[in-house]
Interface confidence: low
């Protein structure tokens, strides 16, 4: 028969989870032992694994609520293709029965005593209620039982007395105008209001109570502006220490407008809150050293060789710079004083050249003189030899970059009758006059 096939079996609840589908045989569903099946929707869920007993169910409620009864629990053989211990087929229930007792005895009803006397009327004037009571003790109930009906009953009563009228206050009258126009002056401003004991007045016969409390009240006026207080200077404070350790500085004295602080629109103190003085440390300030620009590279040479010019022989050259201007224990210049690099010397070497493109136009010269012109050039540019761009001078110290150094003698075909430089000049147009911008502002 076809069954509903599920992907999970929940051990704790015995429920099938994750419906895969219906219309398959048990044998096909249970090709995967993690699956489970139901013969019909809502029917018993059986896991595909080999059969074993489920956990015992919780005990059913006791068969009676009082005295001794009994209660059942069960477990089920769940699984497929086999038997549980005791050679029991899947789906079979096994039961356990035990004695139980929720409450030792069963409740027994009690009986009422006779009614007691009526209590006094609940009021001393006009109409009220009165009450009488009875006890559940003829006989007393047992084992949590009770008596049927109510333990007390009430009825209306009339004292035949007129009730007195007690006094109550009418609403407060308006506040009187304030006794001053600002607060914080010599007299604290106040306002007053009153009320009457007339809502209602207390009765004369029988005598009613008078109204409780006072017939008038006073309060501080709110919303008034504070009275203005003019500010006054406090004393000058100490002179601040000279803020510099060399050269001239500026020290300061301060005073505060707080004797008293101006308040509520009162005027601030007149005059300055600070005054300054020059202080002199009489110590010259340190001046840090600054590197000059690098000097020219020294000629490219190789130790123990008279000349390496125009040869594929790497040499070395250096340039230096000077730390200038350091005074009065200022910082020394950081970094290296000498720079060394590897080089090929092409000083005065005849090299094949080629004409460059035109340079960009230069500046107009002279800038402030008559008839300034600008120029551009084409240069005979040497074609550098294809020497290796890096060399290894010392074993194990890695490759070093090598730079060409020196002024070679480039050779180009003549251009416009020139061998090294061809220049073109043009006049500069609409030239403005040179004026000192500072003088222009005056």
């Amino acid at each position: 028969d076809p069954v509903l096939c599920f992907t999970q079996y929940e051990e704790s609840s015995g429920k099938c989870k994750g419906l895969l589908g219906g219309g398959v045989s048990v044998e096909d569903c249970c090709l995967n032992t993690a699956f489970a099946y139901q013969k019909r929707s809502g029917g018993l869920c059986q896991p595909c694994r080999s059969p074993r007993w489920s956990l015992w169910s919780t005990w059913a409620p006791c068969s009676v609520t009082c005295s001794e009864g009994s209660q059942l629990r069960y477990r089920r053989c769940v699984g497929w293709n086999g038997q549980c211990s005791g050679k029991v087929a899947p789906g079979t229930l096994e039961w356990q029965l035990q004695a139980c007792e929720d409450q030792q005895c069963c409740p027994e009803m009690g009986g009422w005593s006779g009614w007691g006397p009526w209590e006094p009327c609940s009021v001393t004037c006009s109409k009220g209620t009165r009450t009488r009571r009875r006890a559940c003790n003829h006989p007393a109930p047992k084992c949590g039982g009770h008596c049927p009906g109510q333990a007390q009953e009430s009825e209306a009563c009339d004292t035949q007395q007129v009730c007195p009228t007690h006094g109550a206050w009418a609403t407060w009258g308006p506040w009187t105008p304030c006794s001053a126009s600002c607060h914080g002056g010599p007299h604290e401003p106040k306002e007053t209001r009153s009320r009457k004991c007339s809502a209602p007045e207390p009765s004369q016969k029988p005598p009613g109570k008078p109204c409780p409390g006072l017939a008038y009240e006073q309060r501080r006026c709110t919303g008034l502006p504070p009275c203005p207080v003019a500010g006054g200077w406090g004393p000058w404070g100490p002179v601040s220490p000279c803020p510099v350790t060399c050269g001239l500085g500026q020290t300061m004295e301060q005073r505060t407008c707080n004797h008293p602080v101006p308040q509520h629109g009162g005027p601030f103190c007149a005059g300055d809150a600070t005054r300054t003085h020059i202080c002199n440390t009489a110590v010259p300030c340190p001046v840090d050293g600054e590197w000059d620009s690098w000097g020219e590279w020294s000629p490219c040479i190789r130790r123990n060789m008279k000349s390496i010019s125009c040869q594929e022989i790497p040499g070395q050259q250096s340039r230096g710079r000077t730390c200038r201007g350091r005074k009065f224990d200022g910082h020394r210049c950081a970094g290296q004083q000498q720079d060394i690099r590897h080089c090929y010397s092409i000083q005065h070497c005849p090299l094949k050249g080629s004409w460059s493109e035109w340079s960009t136009w230069g500046l107009c010269m002279p800038p402030c003189g008559p008839n300034p012109t600008r120029a551009r050039q084409r240069l005979c540019t040497p074609l550098l030899p294809k020497y290796p761009p890096t060399v290894s001078m010392v074993e194990g110290q890695g490759e070093k970059n090598v730079t060409f150094w020196g002024r070679p003698l480039p050779r180009c075909e003549e251009l416009q009758g020139q061998k090294l430089v061809v220049e073109e000049k043009r006049p500069c147009l609409h030239v403005p006059a040179c004026k000192d911008p500072e003088e222009e502002e005056l």
Epitope: C323, D329, H331, R332, C333, A334, G335, Q336, Q337, Q338
Partner: nanobody, 123 residues
Framework: QVQLVESGGGSVHAGGSLRLSCAVS????????MAWFRQAPGKEREGVAS????????WYADSVKGRFTISQDNAENTLYLQMNSLKSEDTAMYYC????????????????WGQGTQVTVSS
């Protein structure tokens, strides 16, 4: 006057480590150069490493780059040289040197020198 006292030298197998210290006294300037030099028997004295006093500018000889580290503790007025992966060619007398001037490198025209500490590396 300026005094430099080296310590921490000794004998070690190749591949081992040593840490040299140089206690500096009387050196009042906050800047200048501190350096380590070494001299192997029959060879010229050579610069090993230098550092700008109170700063981080460092210089190392190519032969010790990646193996030796120079450092300073200005509060304690001490110069250190941590020497790792030692080789037999590192065997030499090691000197501490100081100078108020720049540049900080391996040239030996320093004004103040210690007495030296011997380092011997055996293979």
């Amino acid at each position: 006057q300026v005094q430099l006292v080296e310590s921490g030298g000794g004998s070690v197998h190749a591949g081992g480590s040593l840490r040299l210290s140089c206690a500096v006294s009387g050196y009042t300037h906050s800047t200048g150069c501190m350096a380590w030099f070494r001299q192997a028997p029959g060879k010229e004295r050579e610069g090993v490493a230098s550092i700008i006093r109170g700063e981080r500018g460092e210089w190392y000889a190519d032969s010790v780059k990646g193996r030796f580290t120079i450092s300073q503790d200005n509060a304690e007025n001490t110069l250190y040289l941590q020497m790792n992966s030692l080789k037999s060619e590192d065997t030499a007398m090691y000197y501490c040197a100081a100078d108020y001037r720049y540049p900080c490198d391996g040239r030996s025209n320093y004004d103040y020198w210690g007495q030296g500490t011997q380092v011997t590396v055996s293979s």
